[in-house]
């Protein structure tokens, strides 16, 4: 969580609210689903590890025309210190395992819960 | 139906050491984060501290000056908080709190409260 | 330590009245900021979280409004069982801060 400076604000962020907004928006995404999130579109599900947002926004960029998840995949870019286009994938993709873009988010919300409440108490 | 369930009431004598328990049940223990607060007779709401029951991470209220200790049990979904250096001013009720952060806020849940009395 | 100002201290209402109550942080709490609802002898319940969001149970009577350091609860119409002592918490960042209360009493 070192290089979330500076993400959607005009200012620096610290790491924490940077964190935050995109729990928020994961959490607005999941909260607001009525028909299947982006058609019910599949990505490659990622380990959930040290280079987990370059790696998630590889995979979620491969979805076009939803835009539920464009601010995400926004958020993402700030998080992620290189420029991520579709097609790329990283080792940290689990390349022979595809899952609904609404399971792979419930499971980046949980983990990223988890990294927030690490950040706050430690 | 998440309950927390605390331990019994408390009487102490001043610098003497308290400790309460909360038994959390209705939820995976380690999703939420634990907090603790008191409430003096008569006053308002003071938040002493809080932890992460899956770290065992913790933060707390420099009012209190080390004198809290907060910890958690996974094998039980007990948390604990210890108040140390006990004095009249401690006399109140303590509760236990806890939730989602991002769905509720961190004080969805509470628990019924615990009198500690310190008295000579 | 962010500080919290609630206003009025107390306040006498009727059955039916709208009340408002408000608090005040000492810096911006980016709307992380709860509040409660507490009657003697029993623990808080919470009414409202993330400043406008209103938790699962909770009449739709009471509602949250705000942003930056000022924020509001709102009971439209006063009902007998809302005589009690209300509690706002800001959690933007440790430490963690309530407000001083404010107790709804009955005209």
């Known amino acids: 969580l070192t290089c979330l400076g500076g993400f959607a604000s005009p200012g620096p962020v610290p790491p924490s609210t940077a964190l935050r907004e995109l729990i928020e928006e994961l959490v607005n995404i999941t909260q607001n689903q009525k028909a299947p999130l982006c058609n019910g579109s599949m990505v490659w599900s990622i380990n959930l590890t040290a280079g987990m947002y370059c790696a998630a926004l590889e995979s979620l960029i491969n979805v076009s025309g939803c835009s539920a998840i464009e601010k995400t995949q926004r958020m993402l870019s700030g998080f992620c210190p290189h420029k991520v286009s579709a097609g790329q994938f990283s080792s940290l993709h689990v390349r022979d395992t595809k899952i609904e873009v609404a399971q792979f988010v419930k499971d980046l919300l949980l983990h990223l819960k988890k990294l927030f409440r690490e950040g706050q108490f430690n | 139906e998440v309950q927390l369930v605390q331990s019994g009431a408390e009487v102490k004598k001043p610098g003497a050491t308290v400790k309460i328990s909360c038994k959390v049940s209705?939820?995976?223990?380690?999703?939420?984060?634990m907090h603790w607060v008191q409430q003096a007779p008569g006053k308002g709401l003071e938040w002493m501290g809080g932890?992460?029951?899956?770290?065992?991470?913790?933060a707390s209220n420099q009012k209190f000056k080390g004198r809290v200790t907060i910890t958690a049990d996974k094998s039980t979904d007990t948390a604990y908080m210890e108040l140390s250096s006990l004095r009249s001013e401690d006399t109140a009720v303590y509760y236990c709190?806890?939730?989602?952060?991002f769905g509720g806020g961190p004080f969805a849940y509470w628990g019924q409260g615990t009198l500690v009395t310190v008295s000579s | 330590d962010i500080q919290m100002t609630q206003s009025p201290s107390s306040l006498s209402a009727s059955v039916g009245d709208r009340v408002t109550i408000t608090c005040k942080a000492s810096?911006?709490?980016?709307?992380?900021l709860s509040w409660f609802q507490q009657k003697p002898g029993k623990a808080p319940k919470s009414l409202i979280y993330?400043?406008?969001r209103l938790v699962d149970g909770v009449p739709s009577r009471f509602s949250g409004s705000g942003s930056g350091q000022d924020y509001t609860l709102t009971i439209s119409s006063l009902d007998p069982e809302d005589f009690a002592t209300y509690y706002c918490?800001?959690?933007?960042?440790?430490?963690?801060?309530f407000g001083g209360g404010t107790k709804v009493e009955i005209k």
């Open positions: 810096q911006d709490i980016n709307s992380y």
């Open positions: 993330r400043a406008n």
């Open positions: 918490l800001q959690y933007d960042e440790f430490p963690y801060t």
């Open positions: 209705g939820y995976t223990f380690t999703d939420y984060e």
């Open positions: 709190t806890s939730g989602d952060y």
């Open positions: 932890i992460d029951p899956e770290t065992g991470g913790t």
